[in-house]
Interface confidence: low
């Protein structure tokens, strides 16, 4: 296959109600016209998918009904929001950029953002 | 067993149409780039027409460009392709191919896997 | 399109003889080269990627080598099961395109 920069922040902290987004961007050697977006987490030398959504360029990505992540794109950057995060999910988070067509195939595999999780604090009871 | 098995091949006028499938088994059709590669007779090799696995992008070669329709059916695990207006320089065996496509952090681009092909005669 | 030109367009050795044939790309296509085995009345078989990965399952007899726009295929010790013809095909600029052939016959 054919080696594609994929370049994404380095760290990002996901908000007190587990929300965490980021930029994933991709220097296209071609003009694809459907692309393939993958969230890999990486944690404790295990890889394992988070979620992925193919996309015609210049259409929204779609991906499935039950999946955490959303996202949008524009141009050869895709803005990705993972949900529903938790202390125990903190972990490198790797955007992988598939070129799915026309031939060739093209790949590129970011360096991965280290995304920290806090669960918040559990807010007192309260007297009314 | 990973195989491909193309039917609709035949003998048919100029100007006639026809209508090849390739029926796939054992792997994940849907995940997979095809192609069809012709293959005339004492001749070589040509790619004719690809589609993505979504079948949402498709690409032909200039020599069947408005005539050849491929399209794919991921329900039913079967690749097409829709042939009009043949001409006599159509007349070839006509394969199926796979492009390799497997969703791991290393990846390739080749056809790995061909069927058996079908032989289209435009003749008359 | 890049043309891919493979010579000799046939050949005849004999058995155990070590048999050659190259392949031209009119541009630089890097490493992107495969290489195929089709046998008579049989479809193509894949058997070099990337110009010099031997895919799973083909004998070690069969390599391939080159950069650029200059490959080259070798069967180190020619068996009568390998008479067939051979393509090579690059992968670097759609459309894909493949050599002529070369039909490799035992002597």
């Known amino acids: 296959c054919k080696a594609m920069h994929v370049a994404q922040p380095a760290v990002v902290l996901a908000s007190s109600r587990g929300i965490a987004s980021f930029v994933c961007e991709y220097a296209s050697p071609g003009k694809a016209t459907e692309v393939r977006v993958t969230v890999l987490r990486q944690a404790d030398s295990q890889v394992t998918e988070v979620c992925a959504a193919t996309y015609m360029m210049g259409n929204e990505l779609t991906f499935l009904d039950d999946s955490i992540c959303t996202g949008t794109s524009s141009g050869n950057q895709v803005n990705l929001t993972i949900q529903g995060l938790r202390a125990m999910d903190t972990g490198l988070y790797i955007c992988k950029v598939e070129l799915m067509y026309p031939p060739p195939y093209y790949l590129g595999i970011g360096n991965g953002t280290q995304i920290y999780v806090i669960d918040p604090e559990p807010c007192p009871d309260s007297d009314f | 067993e990973v195989q491909l098995v193309e039917s609709g091949g035949g003998l048919v006028q100029p100007g006639g149409s026809l209508r090849l499938s390739c029926a796939a088994s054992?792997?994940?059709?849907?995940?997979?780039?095809m192609h069809w590669v012709r293959q005339a007779p004492g001749k070589g090799l040509e790619w004719v027409s690809g589609i993505s696995f979504s079948g949402r992008s498709t690409s032909y070669a200039d020599s069947v460009k408005g005539r050849f329709t491929i399209s794919r059916d991921n329900s039913k695990n079967t690749l097409y392709l829709q042939m009009n207006s043949l001409r006599a320089e159509d007349t070839a065996v006509y394969y199926c191919?796979?492009?390799?496509?497997?969703?791991?952090?290393?990846?390739?681009?080749?056809?790995?896997?061909w069927g058996q092909g079908t032989l289209v005669t435009v003749s008359s | 399109d890049i043309q891919m030109t493979q010579s000799p367009s046939s050949l005849s050795a004999s058995v155990g003889d070590r048999v050659t044939i190259t392949c031209q790309a009119s541009q630089d296509i890097s490493n992107y080269l495969n290489w195929y085995q089709q046998k008579p009345g049989k479809a193509p078989k894949l058997l070099i990627y990337d110009a010099s990965n031997l895919e799973t399952g083909v004998p070690s007899r069969f390599s391939g080598s080159g950069s650029g726009t200059d490959f080259t295929f070798t069967i180190s010790s020619l068996q009568p099961e390998d008479i067939a013809t051979y393509y090579c095909?690059?992968?670097?600029?759609?459309?894909?395109?493949f050599g002529q052939g070369t039909k490799v016959e035992i002597k």
């Open positions: 054992g792997f994940t059709f849907s995940s997979y780039s």
């Open positions: 191919a796979r492009y390799l496509m497997s969703f791991n952090l290393t990846r390739t681009s080749w056809f790995d896997v």
């Open positions: 095909q690059q992968g670097d600029a759609w459309p894909w395109t």
